[in-house]
C-alpha cells in the first residue's frame, strides 16, 4: 500500500510506527532516528505487517569472516510512498538503513526518475554507529518546490559491489493549472464558424475549462481540459480567453482578439515619382488590409480633358511593391489617377484622386520633301525640307537634326548637324569627293527627337564635273532615291 502524505495545517508528533490513514502535509520530513538539531516532524512508514521480511531489492545474506553466523539481508526501511504538496512549499524526505559494522565505505546516492542527482541538491547523510550496526539516514530536502520537482525519488547504496535500492518516494507538486495550449488570435469571415482550443494541466487534476468572450463566460458548465470552443460565427470583433480551474485555483489564458475580415481601407498618399511623355510612375501607401492579405491592386486613370470621352483606363497590378508604372499614355496630357486594392472579401474604395501630367513627346512624323543638291562652288551641299505636321502633344519644335553619311571606297563616316526651328534649309560642307552622301532629317522638340526622314542620296563627283541637279525625297513612298551624276 502507498501511504499518501497530504497538506495539513497541524504538525504531527513523532510516531514510532505506521501512521493510520493518509496524511497531507506541506512540510513533510521523514525520520527514524535522532536528528542532530532542531524539530523533526514525523517519520511516515508504509503499513506493513510486523515481522514480515522485506523481499524487495536486498543484499544477499552473507557469512561472517569467522564463518559462524549469517548476517540479516540488507534493505532500506519502508518509508512514505507518496508526498503531495503545493508549489513553493519546502519538503524533506529520507531513507534509512542499518548496516552491520563489518561493511566499510558505504555511500548512499539519490536518484530521480532514473537519473542520479548530483551537485547542488541538498542531500545530507548522517551516521549513527552502535555496537554491531550503524544506522544511516540519507535526507533530501527541496526548498520552494516547483512542478519540475515532480517525480519518483529513490536511494541507492553500494556495498561490496552490490546495489541496494529503496522503495520509490513519489513527489507530487500541486499548483494552479498550467497552460499547454492557449487560444490563438484569428481573422475570420463574418458569420462563419471557427474553433478555439485551450488545454491546461495540473496536478491536481482534473483541470476544467471555462471560456470567456468579451469578459462574459460562454459556458455555464466547464469542459474537462483540453477544450475546443466552436464559435458559430461573429459579426464584430471579440476577445476570447479561457480560464482553467483545478482544486488549487484558476489560471487565465492570454486574451486573443478574433477579428472580422472586411474589405480593405482605401490606399493613401498616392505620389508621382516620375513622368515621361507616355508614362507615369506612381506609388501609394496601402490602407488597412481588413484583416485579410491584399491580393492585388487596380490603378485607375482618367484623362482630364473636356474633349475626352471620360473613359477610365484600368491597370491591374500586384499588391506589392506599392508602385506601378502607367504606360501607353499620351504626351503632354493631364490625368487623374486613383488606386484601389482588394483582399479576399472585396475591393477597397478608391484612394483620393491625384492629378498628374505627361511631358512633351517627341515628334511622331519626319520632315517632308527633303531635297539635296550640290551648290555651284561644289564645296557645299544644300538641303531643303518642309516642316512636319506635328501634333500639339509633341510640344514646341525646337529644331532639326540632320544626319549625313559619307561613303567612298569602303570608308563610311556619319556626321550630325543641329539647326534651329525656324530653318527649313541647311548647308553642309562636302566632306569627301567622289563619294555618296546620304541625308536624313528629324524634327526635334523638348520631348525628344522624332523619326528620321527617308534617306536621300547624292553623289559628289571628283573636281571638274559640272552637274548641279538636285536629289529629293520622292513624294510619299519608301523608294531609296539616289542621284547619279
Amino acid at each position: 500500500a502507498i501511504t499518501e502524505a497530504r497538506e495539513e495545517a497541524k504538525p504531527y508528533p513523532l510516531f514510532p510506527g505506521p501512521l493510520p490513514g493518509s496524511l497531507q502535509t506541506d512540510h513533510t520530513s521523514l525520520l527514524s532516528l535522532p536528528h542532530t538539531s532542531g524539530y523533526q516532524p514525523a517519520l511516515m512508514f508504509s503499513p506493513t505487517q510486523p515481522g514480515r521480511p522485506y523481499t524487495g531489492n536486498v543484499a544477499i545474506p552473507r557469512v561472517t569472516s569467522a564463518g559462524s553466523k549469517l548476517l540479516p539481508p540488507l534493505a532500506f526501511k519502508h518509508t512514505v510512498g507518496h508526498i503531495i504538496l503545493s508549489e513553493h512549499k519546502d519538503v524533506k524526505f529520507n531513507c534509512s538503513i542499518s548496516v552491520p559494522n563489518i561493511y566499510q565505505d558505504t555511500t548512499i546516492s539519490w536518484w530521480k526518475d532514473g537519473k542520479e542527482l548530483l551537485g547542488a541538491h541538498h542531500a545530507i547523510t548522517q551516521f549513527y554507529p552502535d555496537d554491531e550496526v550503524t544506522a544511516i539516514i540519507a535526507s533530501f530536502s527541496i526548498t520552494s518546490v516547483q512542478r519540475s520537482d515532480n517525480g519518483s525519488y529513490i536511494c541507492k547504496m553500494k556495498i561490496n559491489n552490490e546495489e541496494i535500492v529503496s522503495d520509490p518516494i513519489y513527489i507530487e507538486v500541486q499548483g494552479l493549472p498550467h497552460f499547454t495550449k492557449q487560444p490563438e488570435s484569428m481573422n475570420v469571415t463574418r458569420n462563419t464558424a471557427f474553433n478555439l482550443t485551450c488545454q491546461a494541466v495540473g496536478p491536481p487534476e482534473p483541470v476544467n475549462i471555462f471560456w470567456v468572450q468579451n469578459s462574459s463566460r460562454v459556458n455555464e458548465q466547464p469542459e474537462k481540459s483540453p477544450s475546443v470552443l466552436t464559435v458559430p460565427g461573429l459579426t464584430e470583433m471579440a476577445v476570447f480567453s479561457c480560464e482553467a480551474h483545478n482544486d488549487k485555483g484558476l489560471t487565465v489564458s492570454k486574451g486573443v482578439q478574433i477579428n472580422i475580415k472586411a474589405i480593405p481601407s482605401p490606399p493613401t498618399e498616392v505620389s508621382i515619382h516620375n513622368s515621361t511623355a507616355h508614362s507615369i510612375l506612381i506609388s501609394w501607401v496601402p490602407g488597412f488590409d481588413g484583416y485579410s492579405p491584399f491580393r492585388n491592386c487596380s490603378v485607375q486613370v482618367k484623362e482630364v480633358d473636356p474633349l475626352s470621352n471620360g473613359s477610365v483606363m484600368i491597370f491591374n497590378t500586384s499588391a506589392s511593391p506599392h508602385m506601378y508604372q502607367i504606360k501607353q499614355l499620351q504626351a503632354l496630357a493631364n490625368y487623374s489617377i486613383g488606386v484601389s486594392c482588394m483582399n479576399e472579401i472585396g475591393w477597397s474604395a478608391v484612394s483620393p484622386w491625384i492629378l498628374a501630367s505627361t511631358t512633351e513627346g517627341a515628334p511622331s512624323v519626319a520632315p517632308l520633301n527633303v531635297t539635296v543638291f550640290l551648290n555651284e562652288s561644289r564645296d557645299n551641299v544644300d538641303i531643303r525640307w518642309m516642316k512636319p505636321l506635328t501634333k500639339r502633344q509633341a510640344g514646341e519644335l525646337v529644331g532639326y537634326r540632320i544626319s549625313h553619311v559619307w561613303q567612298s571606297a569602303g570608308i563610311s563616316k556619319e556626321l550630325l548637324e543641329e539647326v534651329g526651328q525656324n530653318n527649313s534649309r541647311a548647308q553642309i560642307s562636302v566632306q569627301v569627293h567622289n563619294a555618296t552622301c546620304t541625308v536624313r532629317i528629324a524634327a526635334v522638340t523638348k520631348g525628344g527627337v522624332g523619326p528620321f526622314s527617308d534617306p536621300v542620296k547624292i553623289f559628289i563627283p571628283a573636281h571638274g564635273w559640272v552637274d548641279h541637279a538636285p536629289s529629293s525625297t520622292p513624294a510619299p513612298g519608301n523608294a531609296d532615291p539616289v542621284l547619279i551624276i
Partner: antibody, heavy 114, light 110 residues
C-alpha cells in the same frame, strides 16, 4: 443547464445534527467543486465549506469542528452535516458552484428551536 | 480572522454609473482572491454576477463589470436600471476559504 437543489429538515432541535443534501444536475461533480453557504435572517452570507473535484475538503475555520462535507459522485449529491445545532444556526442554507459563485440552489430554510 | 468590508449602502440615479468596492483587512486585493460579486433581491436566492478572473456569469449584461481598483475589488454598474436595486455581496478567496463582505444595499433613485 446546471441546477443545484438543497434538501433537508425544516426544523431541528438544539444540540441535534443537521444533514443537508445538495443534488446537482446538468454536470458531474468530478468537474464542479461545490460550496455550502448560509444566510441568517436579515444578515449577510457566510461561507461554510467546499468539496473539491478530487474529493478534498476545506472548511470555515470558526465552524470546522462541527462541519463535515462529503459527496457521492455517482448520485450527484453533496452532503453537509453540522453537529450541535444552536438557535444562532437558524438560516437559509445554499449550495453553490465554487470558483464562480454563480450557480446557486434555491436554498433551504432551517430553523433551530426546541 | 479576515474581514471583508463593503459600503453599507449606495444610491444611483437611473441611467447613472455606480462603483461598489470590496476591501480586505489583510491588505490589497489581488487576482488570486478571485473576487466574486453576488446580487440578491429580498426573498430570492443569490445570483452570481462576476467571478473567477472578473468575468461575467452567463446571461449577465455587460452593464456589470468587475475589476481591481487600487487595492480593492470593484463592481461597476453602468446605465443603472430600477431592477438593479438589490443587495450586492462580494466574496474573496483566501487560500482555502471564502470570506463574504457585509453587503451593499443599492438604491436606484426615482
Amino acid at each position: 443547464q446546471v441546477t443545484l437543489k438543497e434538501s433537508g429538515p425544516v426544523l431541528v432541535k438544539p444540540t441535534e445534527t443537521l444533514t443537508l443534501t445538495c443534488t446537482v444536475s446538468g454536470i458531474s461533480l468530478s468537474s464542479f467543486a461545490i460550496s455550502w453557504i448560509r444566510q441568517p435572517p436579515g444578515k449577510a452570507l457566510e461561507w461554510l465549506a467546499v468539496i473539491w473535484t478530487g474529493g478534498g475538503t476545506d472548511y470555515n475555520s470558526a465552524l470546522k469542528s462541527r462541519l463535515t462535507i462529503s459527496k457521492d459522485t455517482s448520485k450527484s449529491q453533496v452532503v453537509l452535516t453540522m453537529t450541535n445545532m444552536d438557535p444562532v444556526d437558524t438560516a437559509t442554507y445554499y449550495c453553490a458552484s465554487h470558483w464562480y459563485l454563480d450557480v446557486w440552489g434555491q436554498g433551504t430554510t432551517v430553523t433551530v428551536s426546541s | 480572522q479576515t474581514v471583508v468590508t463593503q459600503e453599507p449602502s449606495f444610491s444611483v440615479s437611473p441611467g447613472g454609473t455606480v462603483t461598489l468596492t470590496c476591501r480586505s483587512s489583510t491588505g490589497a486585493v489581488s487576482t488570486s482572491n478571485y473576487a466574486n460579486w453576488v446580487q440578491q433581491t429580498p426573498g430570492q436566492a443569490p445570483r452570481g454576477l462576476i467571478g473567477g478572473a472578473n468575468s461575467r456569469a452567463p446571461g449577465i449584461p455587460d452593464r456589470f463589470s468587475g475589476s481591481i481598483l487600487g487595492n480593492k475589488a470593484a463592481l461597476t454598474i453602468t446605465g443603472a436600471q430600477a431592477d438593479d436595486e438589490s443587495d450586492y455581496y462580494c466574496a474573496l478567496w483566501f487560500s482555502n476559504h471564502w470570506v463574504f463582505g457585509g453587503g451593499t444595499k443599492l438604491t436606484v433613485l426615482g
